[in-house]
Interface confidence: low
Amino acid sequence: KKVVLGKKGDTVELTCTASQKKSIQFHWKNSNQIKILGNQGSFLTKGPSKLNDRADSRRSLWDQGNFPLIIKNLKIEDSDTYICEVEDQKEEVQLLVFGLTANSDTHLLQGQSLTLTLESPPGSSPSVQCRSPRGKNIQGGKTLSVSQLELQDSGTWTCTVLQNQKKVEFKIDIVVLAFQKASSIVYKKEGEQVEFSFPLAFTVEKLTGSGELWWQAERASSSKSWITFDLKNKEVSVKRVTQDPKLQMGKKLPLHLTLPQALPQYAGSGNLTLALEAKTGKLHQEVNLVVMRATQLQKNLTCEVWGPTSPKLMLSLKLENKEAKVSKREKAVWVLNPEAGMWQCLLSDSGQVLLESNIKVLPTWSTPVQP
């Protein structure tokens, strides 16, 4: 007996071929011997089956001795043995219809779980194997679960149902709702304007929710909310903002915040949270601000950084075009009685300069100039 696999909602075409290459009488019946369709001359006739409005054939093929049964908008309950009667012969085709659906929504927050449920006809024993967009394979029976969804799980999941050595494939588009980056770091000289950007890793027609940026300054004992905002159809409106610092926020996506100037008291770490309408849980992105200041006070040239620097970062003071006078894995370095000239304060990681501040040291009778 021939086995054909179908997908719920799809169309299937069951073939039936006569040895004579001409239009002759045929009938398609189900396993209960109820007529589905057949022909009377060149006319298509339909029986009293439940498939009545979804069953069809291709009259154009009858003259070639082909009498297909087409079933549209397949349902699980269409799984049955279909019998084609032609030329005193009976051709049997077993149709098995499967469905695969995602648990709730196909738009899920990063860290949430995805459950895929297989609908299958009674008596079948299919195996299911799904491949995520990042190539991860999971296998199961009636249900497959993936916990802790990651950003790379966004995209097309390809699931293959195997039954009787036949395969049918489902493709489900999953969108993992997350920011593009889990964390970012901004390096600025004291007084410079600071831009924070929080691009989303997904696009949807309408995006509604609310968000907040909490900030833990290095010098502060506790964190505080710097700004709260609403998001309505991708339009941003600020609800509440601190006066110090007074952040400005862009009115369109991607979420964009501007700090008028980088000051040591603002250096630290922030956490932007975004709660989306009709979703449980929140999206998070961490942002860090490192601030550098170079000063000369009497005979002491000092360079300092504030904010979350890693222990392997190197802070150096050097006279332009000369070797570093001092380099330390510390947050402050200084030179006593510096020579006149343009001094550079450099914050670097494995030789790559992350932040640079220049200060001009004049001969001892003059005042230092900061460019």
């Epitope: 491949r131 991860k136 394979n137 293959t160 494939e169 588009d173």
Partner: antibody, heavy 118, light 113 residues
């Protein structure tokens, strides 16, 4: 049964862009992954990449910087663009689809020869 | 990228006799999560496009005669033809699809002695 037919110019000048289209009949373009493979004369097969109707793509890293794939569901077509071509890109280009067997290439077009020459 | 190698590169055969082609991958094609081995075999007959013979190590594609069979594990794979027929001539390629980019073997040319 799904049938595929490649079309496009048979001759492309060096440094220009190679553009090919694959027309799908006997099936919906929305159902499968759509791939491009090439074969230089007398040589083996090289997988260029594939596209799905969600727009998600997977490209061969060796060609990624030069390749763009797209589709037009209304015309049941998908296309390949390969820019900055050289003589090394001369090959028979095939379009293919998985046909519901995971990532395997179940249906292939008959192939079209593209020669890169001035 | 995963490198695929095939032996022999040329195989003269006698109709009615068995034939065997070997394929090796530079890393395992067995997916430990699902137990599947992501290796396919394709045949390119003279002047034609390639056609799928065997997928996921051992499943015969639709319409492929049962004289073709695929086997193997990990990194070593074999395509067997139990009784070669004249229509089986052409170039046989193995292909891995456990990771991107998918890669093909160099091909084995089968012709009649």
């Amino acid at each position: 049964q799904v049938q595929l037919q490649e079309s496009g110019p048979g001759l492309v000048k060096p440094s220009e862009t190679l553009s090919l289209t694959c027309t799908v009949s006997g099936g919906s373009i929305g159902s499968y992954y759509w791939s491009w493979i090439r074969q230089p004369a007398g040589k083996g097969l090289e997988w260029i990449g594939r596209i799905y109707t969600s727009g998600s793509t997977n490209y061969n890293p060796s060609l990624k910087s030069r390749v763009t794939m797209s589709f037009d569901t209304s015309k049941n077509q998908f296309s390949l663009k390969l820019n900055s071509v050289t003589a090394a890109d001369t090959a028979v280009y095939y379009c293919a689809t998985d046909g519901g067997v995971g990532d395997s290439l179940d249906y292939w077009g008959q192939g079209t020869l593209v020669t890169v020459s001035s | 990228d995963i490198v695929m190698t095939q032996t022999p590169l040329s195989l003269p055969v006698t109709p009615g006799e068995p034939a065997s082609i070997s394929c090796r991958s530079s890393q395992s094609l067995l997916d430990s999560d699902d137990g599947n081995t992501y290796l396919d075999w394709y045949l390119q007959k003279p002047g034609q496009s390639p056609q799928l013979l065997i997928y996921t190590l051992s499943y015969r594609a639709s319409g492929v005669p049962d004289r073709f069979s695929g086997s193997g594990s990990g990194t070593d794979f074999t395509l067997k033809i139990s009784r070669v027929e004249a229509e089986d001539v052409g170039v046989y390629y193995c292909m891995q699809h456990i990771e991107f980019p998918f890669t093909f073997g160099p091909g084995t040319k089968v012709d009649i002695k």
